[in-house]
Amino acid sequence: QNLFTKDVTVIEGEVATISCQVNKSDDSVIQLLNPNRQTIYFRDFRPLKDSRFQLLNFSSSELKVSLTNVSISDEGRYFCQLYTDPPQESYTTITVLVPPRNLMIDIQRDTAVEGEEIEVNCTAMASKPATTIRWFKGNTELKGKSEVEEWSDMYTVTSQLMLKVHKEDDGVPVICQVEHPAVTGNLQTQRYLEVQYKPQVHIQMTYPLQGLTREGDALELTCEAIGKPQPVMVTWVRVDDEMPQHAVLSGPNLFINNLNKTDNGTYRCEASNIVGKAHSDYMLYVYDPPTTIPPPTTTTTTTTTTTTTILTIITDSRAGEEGSIRAVDH
């Protein structure tokens, strides 16, 4: 056997090159046949009407032909025939790769509530061979379940991802990524998750800045409530008591002027949205006003030591020297 060919793999729409090579040439007629055994080239002449076949080289040692705009129907065995005595035949297999025509991501619900499990589907249509689908939530790879449907030598792959959503997932992309031999680089499609979650409530003491509340001082607390949808109602209540008469409520802010010991207690900020409600508590303890030290009567040199005390709002409810905030979700 001195007739040689090589198999060819080509992407649909591109160019395949078929080469029939003769090692020891004796000027015998060489021809190239298609999978239906129709003659494409007889020596350097193309009797076949398909003008996508073009002669690249013809010599006593090679018949080289290009096939442009390859389609899936071109796939199969192409025969090189050499009319020696006895005749020789060799075949080359053209394999046509078809990238997925369409990549669609479909999310069960546009908006999900935290804690829910949602179904996300990704479909890669009409590829050959079947496409591999990978899932990512942000940068984290997730495992989906794929189903392959074959039709007319083409494959449609649908991958299903069951995803339990958390509030941190809001705005995070769910990415369907395709791996296919006919696709170079990244072919992907994505949808951004929209996750609704109940409010997270935080109380911030905006006055006094140093955090120590004394009689006669003013107190200002700001309630920050973040949720999706954004809470429409933010309310202040005093736990187990009436709100002081001199307390002023202005949206998320609570002002109490001229603090006195009767203002001691737990102040609660409550926020709600369609998902649920939550609150955070602030325990107010009003300290005695500072005592004034009389000026010295003798002329002496004194060294003043300034002690800076950093006060921290803590998140438990122990009775201490400063007010404390406790956040509670309901």
Epitope: S28, N36, T39, R43, L48, Y83, T84
Partner: antibody
Framework: EVQLVESGGGLVKPGGSLRLSCAAS????????MSWVRQAPGKGLEWVSA????????YYADSVKGRFTISRDNSKNTLYLQMNSLRAEDTALYYC?????????WGRGTLVTVSS | SSELTQDPAVSVALGQTVRITCQGD??????ASWYQQKPGQAPVLVIY???NRLSGIPDRFSGSSSGNTASLTITGAQAEDEADYYC???????????FGGGTKLTVLG
């Protein structure tokens, strides 16, 4: 000069045999497939048989299969057609032609008459 | 076996254009070749492939193909074009040659 010259035709009785020859000159004979084409008096062209350049592959029309044998001697640049069991309907002018898929060179023909 | 069908006879006025057609299933895949044969002479290849003329053939001869029909067109027919015209192709295997029945072209005037 590039040419083909047929010979060997004549009058033969039904059931008889005849061997036609075609001498080629002016081109590399072994590089080309060759065919025999015949034409009955007042009729159209009919392909009879073909042979590859090396002689390794042969093809026949259904009407002559089993009765005719095509061969070649590349050292003599000669094509042959051995015709056995001849019938009246084999009466025709027999042309040899260079087969490039299309027939780009023809001889003048040799007449075969099958008659009792 | 494959068959090629031609009109038995066609006539054309001198200097006019004439088209000779050839029909057959094999022509869906393969180009036809066209041969001119004058009385008492061997056939001569006129057109082969998509529209290739053998050297020495006037450019008034051209070939075309559509579907299962091949056509030979003579643009500005001359008296010397009067002859029998045969189309030929191969069967689908490419191993068996088939000829049309031939068309007798008469040039009038």
């Amino acid at each position: 000069e590039v040419q083909l010259v047929e010979s060997g035709g004549g009058l033969v009785k039904p059931g008889g045999s005849l061997r036609l020859s075609c001498a080629a000159s002016g081109f590399t004979f072994s590089s080309y497939a060759m065919s025999w084409v015949r034409q009955a008096p007042g009729k159209g062209l009919e392909w009879v048989s073909a042979i590859s350049g090396s002689g390794g592959s042969t093809y026949y029309a259904d009407s002559v299969k089993g009765r005719f044998t095509i061969s070649r001697d590349n050292s003599k640049n000669t094509l042959y057609l051995q015709m056995n069991s001849l019938r009246a309907e084999d009466t025709a002018l027999y042309y040899c032609a260079r087969d490039n898929w299309y027939f780009d060179l023809w001889g003048r023909g040799t007449l075969v008459t099958v008659s009792s | 076996s494959s068959e090629l069908t031609q009109d038995p006879a066609v006539s054309v006025a001198l200097g006019q254009t004439v088209r000779i057609t050839c029909q057959g299933d094999s022509l869906r895949s393969y180009y036809a070749s066209w041969y001119q044969q004058k009385p008492g002479q061997a056939p001569v290849l006129v057109i082969y492939g998509k529209n290739n003329r053998l050297s020495g053939i006037p450019d008034r001869f051209s070939g075309s193909s559509s579907g299962n029909t091949a056509s030979l067109t003579i643009t500005g027919a001359q008296a010397e074009d009067e002859a029998d015209y045969y189309c030929n192709s191969r069967d689908s295997s490419g191993n068996h040659v088939v000829f049309g029945g031939g068309t007798k072209l008469t040039v009038l005037g």
